[in-house]
């Protein structure tokens, strides 16, 4: 175009994609009457008439801009809507009078790219590679113009470095005219980079100024040879029989080598391989004292076939053996004495305790329990507890039953039972003695006997309440080689005046139960076990 070289630089108008560009024709009234203006778009030095203003009336020309132009600002401004990257070109207004004059506008279009998407190389990078390997790829979609990418490692920007760091960027143009940028970071990494955080940053411009968007941070799998192998035992601390114990191999290489765990055979001193689970963990559940011993781990690098051995580790599974009590089944006459001795073995120092089985009362702290002037009440269970104080929960116990010779001894001497005529009554009678007594009833009925413990027996009787039975009452008799004893149950008919609550009897339409709740003998004692502690 003649005289174009002398033209001043075009006015710069900057807009974002999708917005409206206001192209103000800078011709002064002296240069040309704005009531008669032609607007052109200039692309590759080719002018295309896009809009005409005649006598102040604006109208678009057919073509790509036809639907997007309108005259504004009393004819001085042409508005271009829904700006696209393809609109980045020179626009020119040309006034016709008094002589042809031009005013040029350079439209610059911008669009922020989407958040950068970073993908780490899933295959990882060996530290001994001869040249930079692909670490990660950063993609910034739909930006305009092409954004700049900066790679960061641990918050520091990475620069191109011969044979160490190489950044390879490329871009594609979408059908929209927007750019998608792809940048590949290649680097030679060292073992210390296994925890390094990499991210990419896109720098771009908008009419409002410079901006940036950062990707998320990623770590790349770094492969390096194993230098050390070691064993780890869980749980940490003192182990006891019954625990779940896990022995695992660990290594400082990536990927870890192939592991095998061996235990030294105490008799042959040879290392014997143990069977591990799929994860290479040796699980001892429940742990036993036989699991104690010397363990070691072997790590085999399947690429180099180099084998590494861990430091051996002693495993001690603490135990308490079966508890033995002597005598095992003591029998004594009333008034005599008895010494009970408790024995057990352990991997740790033991503590012994003797408890009365029925009450839980601690009788002695130590392995020997001495009982003097034995009474009938002294008969029954005694428990020895062997425990390791330093390892909570590690203990074993043994129960011994002490038998005191004597005639039967009734749980009650006599009892009143409220009944209804023609009901089936369920009666019970309890007796103890050594040898253990048997119980008989003075009436016909269905009787059954249960041994409660070596010296105690319980008999239950189901009987129909008849007038004769009401007359005679019911007796139960206990007998052994040393004598006999009797309990009496008095039956009384229920009526509204006599019906009173009785904690010792249960009555219903068809059953009534009479069970001993207290001992009839003045010498008997009964202790309750202590309540268990409530743990929050």
């Amino acid at each position: 175009v003649p005289g174009e070289a002398e033209q001043p630089a075009p006015e710069l108008v900057e807009v974002e994609v999708g917005s409206t560009a206001l192209l103000k024709c800078g011709l002064s009234q002296s240069q040309g009457n704005l009531s008669h203006v032609d607007w052109f778009s200039v692309h590759k030095e080719k002018r295309t008439l896009i809009f005409r203003v005649r006598q102040g009336q604006g109208q678009s020309e057919p073509g790509e801009y036809e639907q997007r132009l309108s005259l504004q600002d009393r004819g001085a401004t042409l508005a271009l809507t829904q700006v696209t990257p393809q609109d980045e070109r020179i626009f020119l207004c040309q006034g016709k009078r008094p002589r042809s004059q031009e005013y040029r506008i350079q439209l610059r279009v911008y669009k922020a790219p989407e958040e950068p998407n970073i993908q780490v190389n899933p295959l990882g990078i060996p530290v001994n590679s001869k040249e930079p390997e692909e670490v990660a790829t950063c993609v910034g979609r739909n930006g305009y113009p092409i954004p700049q990418v900066i790679w960061y490692k641990n918050g520091r920007p990475l620069k191109e470095e011969k044979n160490r760091v190489h950044i390879q960027s490329s871009q594609t143009v979408e059908s929209s005219g927007l750019y998608t940028l792809q940048s590949i970071l290649k680097a030679q990494l060292v073992k210390e980079d296994k925890d390094a955080q990499f991210y990419c940053e896109l720098n771009y411009r908008l009419p409002s100024g410079n901006h940036m968007k950062e990707s998320r941070e990623v770590t790349v799998p770094v492969f390096y040879p194993t230098e050390k192998v070691w064993l780890e035992v869980e749980p940490v601390g003192m182990l006891k029989e019954g625990d779940r114990v896990e022995i695992r191999c660990l290594a400082d290489g990536n990927p870890p080598p192939h592991f095998s765990i061996s235990k030294q055979n105490p008799s042959t001193r040879e290392a014997e391989e143990e069977t591990t689970n799929d994860n290479g963990v040796l699980v001892l559940e429940p742990a036993r004292k036989e699991h104690s011993g010397r363990y070691e781990c072997q790590g085999l690098d399947l690429d180099t076939m180099i084998s590494l051995l861990s430091e051996p580790q002693e495993l001690l599974v603490n135990y308490v053996s079966d508890v033995r009590v002597s005598p095992a089944a003591p029998e004594r006459q009333e008034g005599s004495s008895l010494t009970l001795t408790c024995e057990a073995e352990s991997s740790q120092d033991l503590e012994f305790q003797w408890l009365r089985e029925e009450t839980g009362q601690v009788l002695e702290r130590g392995p020997v329990l001495q009982l003097h002037d034995l009474k009938r009440e002294a008969g029954g269970g005694y428990r020895c507890v062997a425990s390791v104080p330093s390892i909570p929960g590690l203990n074993r116990t043994q129960l011994v039953n002490v038998a005191i010779f004597g005639p039967p001894w009734m749980a009650f001497k006599e009892r009143k039972v409220w009944v209804k005529e023609n009901m089936v009554l369920n009666l019970s009678c309890e007796a103890s003695g050594h040898p253990r007594p048997t119980i008989s009833w003075n009436v016909n009925g269905t009787a059954s006997e249960q041994d409660q413990d070596p010296q105690r027996v319980l008999s239950t009787l189901n009987v129909l309440v008849t007038p004769e039975l009401l007359e005679t009452g019911v007796e139960c008799t206990a007998s052994n080689d040393l004598g006999k004893n009797t309990s009496i149950l008095f039956l009384e008919l229920v009526n509204l005046t006599t019906l009173t609550p009785d904690s010792n009897t249960t009555t219903g339409l068809s059953t009534s139960t009479a069970s001993p709740h207290t001992r009839a003998n003045s010498t008997s004692t009964e202790r309750k076990l202590p309540e268990p502690e409530s743990r929050g």
Epitope: T20, R54, Q55, Q57, G58, S60, S70, T81
Partner: antibody, heavy 117, light 106 residues
Framework: QIQLVQSGPELKKPGETVKISCKTS????????MHWVKQAPRKGLKWMGW????????TYADDFKGRFAFSLETSASTAYLQINNLRNEDTATYFC??????????WGQGTLVTVSA | DIVMTQSHKFMSTSVGDRVNITCKAS??????VAWYQQKPGQSPKLLIY???TRHTGVPDRFTGSGSGTDFTLTINNVQSEDLADYFC????????FGGGTKLEIK
Amino acid sequence: QIQLVQSGPELKKPGETVKISCKTSGYTFTDYSMHWVKQAPRKGLKWMGWINTETGEPTYADDFKGRFAFSLETSASTAYLQINNLRNEDTATYFCVSYDYDAVSYWGQGTLVTVSA
Amino acid sequence: DIVMTQSHKFMSTSVGDRVNITCKASQYVGAAVAWYQQKPGQSPKLLIYWASTRHTGVPDRFTGSGSGTDFTLTINNVQSEDLADYFCQQYGNYRTFGGGTKLEIK
């Protein structure tokens, strides 16, 4: 003051031709563009197009291409609208409208054209 | 072509009230919009041009607003003489009128 005076009402048969005049005064005729607007009975306004009073170049809206013609008699400061081959649907009031460069408009009083067999 | 849509064909109001008459362009027209009032048997009368500039002699109870594609003519303190048809028109690219809104006084 600026005035636009239009010719009187017309009663025409289908197929005939009508020519409406719009005489202006109070301003330089060639300074302002001249537009034509149609208003059918009890309907809205429809822009028909305009004529450049400097060059005589007409511009027609899509619905008014073919049978409609804008012309000028600059010496008489008069604009004309001619409708050929009249149809019933051409029955309407036609307005001439002059616009200055600032988009201020000046309207004629309107001419009613009735097309009836 | 740019289409101007006046969604309300009729609007009913009372004397003293305020009324908003709206107009939507099918594409961006910036501020190149005028509003006209037409009473029965008369030529349209220019009220507003360049979207918000009041024409000479138009009472200040008439106000125009909007830009781009959405425009509003507001009449404050409606008077009985405001009973008329109201048209919007764009002139950013050729010219087109809206379909009109008839203002009725209750």
